[in-house]
């Protein structure tokens, strides 16, 4: 249960640097595991809790995407033709786009076990935690699933396809006024 999760991340007290330090134990082990679903509501299933992306600061998330996340997605896809994969995942508005982005980025899927430790994923998680009210607490409460990153990352074709879908979702997120095709 939640107590076990919090027990695994207890904070130790230390003195240091004239200020104060309290270090989270096994902080890299903290992650999230949610079921992979597609919703058009802007809600993310999280056990019995649904995260609603409606109140996020979309402009600041967009700025983070344009300045850095987009570049990391391109780096991940380097060596892949832009026409190689068809976009099969779509979103209708900004909250819905973030729901799909969250789902594809952090939920394990068949053939692509985890993208969560990729740089674009870490930055996505940071952006959501900072600019989506209450999002960080849902991550603290979430079931621990993301284990420490392996030394060697395996990029499967399925993962490339998934990241290609993510690029499409992010592009759609940046153009919310466009009519759905």
């Amino acid at each position: 249960g939640l107590n076990d999760i919090f027990e695994a991340q207890k904070i130790e007290w230390h003195e240091g640097g004239g200020g104060s330090e309290q270090k989270l134990i096994s902080e890299e082990d903290l992650g999230s595991s949610h079921h992979h679903h597609h919703h058009s509501s802007g809600l993310v299933p999280r056990g019995s809790h649904m995260y609603d992306f409606t109140n996020c600061d979309f402009e600041k998330i967009k700025a983070a995407y344009l300045s850095t996340i987009s570049k990391d997605l391109i780096t991940y896809m380097s060596g892949t033709k832009s026409t190689e994969f068809n976009n099969t995942v779509s979103c209708s508005n900004r909250p819905h786009c973030l729901t799909e982005i969250q789902s594809l980025t952090f939920n394990p899927t068949a053939g692509c076990a985890s993208l969560a430790k990729e740089m674009f994923a870490m930055k996505t998680k940071a952006a959501l935690a900072i600019w989506c009210p209450g999002y960080s607490e849902t991550q603290i409460n979430a079931t621990q699933a993301m284990k420490k990153a392996r030394k060697s990352k395996v990029t499967t074709n399925k993962c490339l396809e998934q990241v290609s879908q993510l690029q499409g979702l992010w592009r759609r997120f940046n153009r919310p006024l466009l009519k759905q095709q």
Epitope: K125, W131, G134, S136
Partner: antibody, heavy 120, light 107 residues
Framework: QVQLVQSGPEVKKPGSSVKVSCKAS????????MHWVRQRPGQGLEWMGT????????DYNQNFKGRATITADKSTSTAYMELSSLRSEDTAVYYC?????????????WGQGTLVTVSS | EIVLTQSPGTLSLSPGERATLSCRAS??????VHWYQQKPGEAPRLLIY???QSISGIPDRFSGSGSGTDFTLTISRLESEDFAVYYC?????????FGTGTKVEIK
């Protein structure tokens, strides 16, 4: 061991600027945002803003927008907070504090504080 | 901006007594509240995070509870080193804000 070491006390004239530094060590700098919090004499804590090294961006409390500039030098793991157009009400202790952006999400380490005195 | 109001402003108690500190948010913030202790001339020290989560190294006489808009920090039996100022903080949304503070003083 995690340490946040801030620069020393400053005495400034009204209308001038001050730049306070916060050198971090003992952890991966980009895994944490660096927040700045100030405390006027005998008063409570006031969040000023943050720099998020992972995203290379800042965010501010509107009360300080335009006067505060929060930056960082990732190569030296040092964060900076510059406050311009100083007035006597800016006399305060300024703290830096780290907060995880992909885990923990709480200010679990603080600098020792930097006293800035604004006086003519 | 979310306003956090702490009460009482000052709590005068004797060592060994129970202290109950309140923090009320101007809007629901689920469990995104943390508690800090501050002594004169020192930086704040994290005591409780996400409303009720305890921290190793912090005595278990400190406990937190609440969700939504009402939060409580309880010190079950006051020790001499517990006399200080206590602040609640919300990280539900930017700008992050702190409570007005409660001073726990020796009666």
């Amino acid at each position: 061991q995690v340490q946040l070491v801030q620069s020393g006390p400053e005495v400034k004239k009204p209308g001038s600027s001050v730049k306070v530094s916060c050198k971090a060590s003992g952890y991966i700098f980009t895994d944490y945002a660096m927040h700045w919090v100030r405390q006027r004499p005998g008063q409570g804590l006031e969040w000023m803003g943050t720099f998020i090294p992972l995203l290379d961006t800042s965010d501010y409390n509107q009360n300080f927008k335009g006067r505060a500039t929060i930056t960082a030098d990732k190569s030296t793991s040092t964060a900076y907070m510059e406050l311009s157009s100083l007035r006597s009400e800016d006399t305060a202790v300024y703290y830096c504090a780290r907060m995880g952006v992909t885990h923990s999400y709480v200010m679990d380490a603080w600098g020792q504080g930097t006293l800035v005195t604004v006086s003519s | 901006e979310i306003v956090l109001t702490q009460s009482p402003g000052t709590l005068s108690l004797s060592p060994g007594e129970r202290a109950t500190l309140s923090c009320r948010a101007s809007q629901p913030i689920s469990i995104s509240v943390h508690w800090y202790q501050q002594k004169p001339g020192e930086a704040p020290r994290l005591l409780i995070y996400f409303a009720s989560q305890s921290i190793s190294g912090i005595p278990d006489r400190f406990s937190g509870s609440g969700s939504g808009t009402d939060f409580t920090l309880t010190i079950s039996r006051l020790e001499s080193e517990d006399f200080a100022v206590y602040y609640c903080q919300q990280t539900f949304s930017l700008p992050y804000t702190f409570g007005t503070g409660t001073k726990v003083e020796i009666k």
